[in-house]
Interface confidence: medium
């Protein structure tokens, strides 16, 4: 083992950690558990304890980021550097950062939790053997009802352990149908649909009717995503594998490496590759977040790399299911902190998460009838309308800043960013925000502290928008974006992650634009942005004045309010309404007087 010059270490034993944001690769509970287990490895052999806290004052701040993520040590895309950590100390010292361009897993492929079946909600095991064939994604083979399933062990033929994968044929999410599965085919606007669709929505989310006729019954749900078969790269990134698919006249019901010299698994994203040529790479095994975190936390505690190839602190990733700590790791950490007081601990045990619904034990083969029990429903909300109330705000939880004249929104000359969130207008300035609801005599509420509600954000924001269905909030500042879902944050991520080049210094606004699309603005340019894929179409770049003639070219904020577009320059706004495909300026006014209804005294 090796430590650092001067044996850098923590000088207290009760270490705190904060999970600042999450990767979308794993369920949050799995990420929480991976970090907790990684810390438990070190606490098991030392006097150290690790306590999760929820503030930036933590000793060890854990963050997912990509490329140059704000600390001077950029990540490098997929593979290569997986993560890095700083030595013990104040501020950023001791922090651990994980490259979100990696596929994070538990080391054995994407984590797909199952329902029903006979595996108590265990995750799929990829690859698995069924009838002598290897499967790297959920399959409908062996079933007549079209329900995708997987084995939860490496070999279904010998172990008979399985569960059902997320599927719209098994359940839907949210919507208003109590989680009932899709009914195919179904009628929507007089047309027949035999698969989930985004038609009728402007946000790109896939949905289905849960009865045969949506027009009559108005019952629907959203279709679950399938991490196991969401492709990367190729020419269809973010799409789902379609099984079976035809390639060179032959049918494939699982990912294949046929036609490639590098052994990488791929699939078609339509039923016929030969005619459509649409494809992508299937998810690989990914990196074990638990093992990488355990290694990084070793660094954050003061351990350098080990020269022992079997040690956890050896500088190469190696997946193992055995006990990760080698004697060399134990000697190193005890050199810094001493041994754990007697008695010696047992190895930490982990419990398998219980399924959300009581499993039904099925016959020895994957069942061919629907499970008798259905999943419990998600929240019921109107099918396509925005939320009925402000989704993220609430005066009860926000700290009101002591009032001074500058804290009156009516005295703010130029706001940093303005956004419609829920049914309210949010106005941001220098670390503070106000909320405004239109109505006779109403005044902006606030100011509140941004840091209280969205602690990961910087004081200065360039633009903000809410994605209405998922209630995701996108916050832009400089070359970075943060995405909040409730109190959880993903980011900061570089604008590169959204497909915006290095020449885009900031995002100055966003407007809704058709199904699942936004327009993102930066100065005089705009791009079409796919909300679901979180990616701009680089070919869609256009000049603002071509699409919105008559607005100023140096706007500092663009936002949508009451279905109209507002372009802000200085204290003024140019309001644009769309009529028969034409965007026309229909009003110019003051933000304070004309939107916030401030008195003109």
């Amino acid at each position: 083992f090796q430590t650092f010059e001067g044996d850098l270490k923590w000088h207290h034993h009760n270490i705190t950690y904060w999970i600042q944001n999450y990767s979308e690769d794993l369920p949050r509970a799995v990420i929480d558990d991976a970090f907790a287990r990684a810390f438990a490895l070190w606490s098991a052999v030392t006097p150290l304890t690790f306590t999760r806290v929820y503030s930036r004052d933590a000793d060890i701040v854990i963050q997912f980021g990509v490329a140059e993520h704000g600390d001077g040590y950029p990540f490098d895309g997929k593979d290569g550097l997986l993560a890095h950590a700083f030595p013990p100390g104040p501020g950023i010292q001791g922090d651990a950062h994980f490259d979100d361009d990696e596929l994070w897993s538990l080391g054995k492929g994407v984590v797909v939790p199952t329902r029903f079946g006979n595996a108590d909600g265990a995750a799929c095991h990829f690859p698995f053997i069924f009838e002598g064939r290897s499967y790297s994604a959920c399959t409908t083979d062996g079933r007549s009802d079209g329900l995708p399933w997987c084995s939860t062990t490496a070999n279904y033929d010998t172990d008979d352990r399985f569960g059902f994968c997320p599927s719209e044929r098994l359940y839907t999410q949210d919507g208003n149908a109590d989680g009932k599965p899709c009914q195919f085919p179904f009628i929507f606007q007089g047309q027949s649909y035999s698969a989930c669709t985004t038609d009728g929505r402007s946000d790109g989310y896939r949905w289905c009717a849960t009865t045969a006729n949506y027009d009559r019954d108005k019952l629907f749900g959203f279709c679950p995503t399938r991490a196991d078969s969401t492709v990367m790269g190729g020419n269809s990134a973010g799409e789902l594998c379609v099984f079976p698919f035809t390639f060179l006249g032959k049918e494939y019901s699982t990912c294949t490496s046929e036609g490639r010299g590098d052994g990488r698994l791929w699939c078609a994203t339509t039923s016929n590759f030969d005619s459509d040529k649409k494809w992508g790479f299937c998810p690989d095994q990914g990196y074990s977040l638990f093992l990488v975190a355990a290694h990084e936390f070793g660094h954050a505690l003061g351990l350098d790399h080990s020269s022992v190839p079997e040690a956890l602190m050896y500088p190469m990733y190696r997946f193992t299911e055995g006990p990760p700590l080698h004697k060399d790791d134990v000697n190193g950490i005890r050199h810094l902190y001493g041994p754990r007081p007697e008695p010696e601990p047992r190895p930490p045990t982990t419990t398998t998460p219980q399924p959300t619904a009581p499993p039904t034990v099925c016959p020895t083969g994957p069942p061919t009838v629907h499970p008798s029990e259905r999943p419990t429903a998600g929240p019921t909300g109107p099918p396509s309308a925005g939320p009925t109330g402000p989704p993220t705000a609430g005066p009860s939880t926000a700290t009101t800043v002591p009032l001074s004249p500058v804290d009156d929104a009516c005295n703010v000359n130029i706001f940093d960013a303005i956004a419609e969130i829920g049914n309210q207008l949010y106005l941001f300035k220098d670390g503070k925000y106000w909320r405004f609801s239109e109505g006779r005599g109403s005044r902006p509420q606030g100011p509140f502290l941004i840091a209280d509600k969205w602690p990961a954000l910087p004081r200065k924001l360039d633009s903000v928008f809410e994605e209405r269905l998922s209630k995701k909030l996108f916050f832009f500042s400089g070359r970075q974006v943060w995405v909040y879902t409730g109190a959880s944050v993903l980011g900061p991520r570089r604008l590169d992650k959204l497909g915006l080049g290095a020449d885009v210094a900031q995002v100055t606004g966003a407007l809704r634009s058709g199904r699942g699309k936004m327009l993102l603005f930066s100065g005089r340019r705009l791009w079409r942005f796919d909300v679901k894929a979180q990616m701009v179409d680089p070919r869609s770049a256009s000049e603002v004045d071509r699409m919105f003639p008559g607005v100023p070219l140096d706007t500092h904020d663009v936002f949508q309010y009451r279905e109209k577009a507002y372009f802000c320059q200085d204290r003024f706004y140019w309001r644009v309404s769309s009529r028969s495909e034409l965007n026309q300026v229909d009003q110019v006014g003051y933000v304070t007087y004309d939107i916030l209804q401030c008195p003109e005294d």
């Epitope: 001077g72 950029p74 895309g77 550097l81 997986l82 993560a83 890095h84 501020g91 950023i92 350098d304």
Partner: antibody, heavy 124, light 107 residues
């Protein structure tokens, strides 16, 4: 003993190109973050470009963005800087520098080894 | 970008005297500061990393202190070989930036 040896400098006309190389020895090159730093005659130090250990991440000073390309060949323990569309203001001694930070253990701010430098003169 | 301002621009001292060189960042950089020494015709040499840690082979008369925005390089007793230009450099925020340098000359 750690050594960094630059080569490839010389006199070039404005708009021309040069490729600098930096041969590294005495350390595990593939694990370290590497840099190019330049110094115009009689002036201070200016960061030019950065590359991560795998080569997957590269960054550039605004003054050279779009004209210079940093790369590395870990099998040859060599760092490169391809300089195109050279301007008079690019005239400087170019140093390659090894970061103290390596692999996933970061936080050590400082370049602990530097090459002897190679002079690039852009003039007509 | 973070601006690094060094003072004084030139410092004239005699051998055996104590030298105090200052470096100020335009915003907080925690302890991510390094000091370099450069002699004419030579490459810079790392003296101090992370504000206060002496690099390998650097004599004990060199010490660094400070965090946040204000940093100091101290040479407790000047030796003839210490006369050179000294640069500070930050990595607390991207992009990294150098100070303009302090020339230490013999009085």
């Amino acid at each position: 003993e750690v050594q960094l040896l630059e080569s490839g400098g010389g006199l070039v006309q404005p708009g021309g190109s040069l490729r600098l190389s930096c041969a590294a020895s005495g350390f595990t090159f593939s694990r370290y973050h590497m840099w190019w730093v330049r110094q115009a005659p009689g002036k201070g130090l200016e960061w030019v470009s950065y590359i991560s250990p795998s080569g997957g991440s590269t960054l550039y000073a605004d003054s050279v963005k779009g004209r210079f390309t940093i790369s590395r060949d870990n099998s040859k323990n060599t760092l490169y800087l391809q300089m195109n569309s050279l301007r008079a203001e690019d005239t400087a001694v170019y140093y390659c520098a090894k970061d103290r930070a390596y692999g996933d253990y970061v936080g050590w701010n400082g370049f602990d080894y530097w090459g002897q430098g190679t002079l690039v003169t852009v003039s007509s | 970008d973070i601006q690094m301002t060094q003072s004084p621009a030139t410092l004239s001292l005699s051998p055996g005297e104590r030298a105090t060189l200052s470096c100020r960042a335009s915003q907080s950089i925690s302890s991510f500061l390094a000091w370099y020494q450069q002699k004419p015709g030579q490459a810079p040499r790392l003296l101090i990393y992370d504000a206060s840690y002496r690099a390998t082979g650097i004599p004990a008369r060199f010490s660094g202190s400070g965090s946040g925005t204000d940093f100091t390089l101290t040479i407790s007793s000047l030796e003839p070989e210490d006369y050179a230009v000294y640069y500070c450099q930050q990595r607390g925020n991207w992009p990294i930036t150098f100070g303009q340098g302090t020339r230490l000359e013999i009085k």
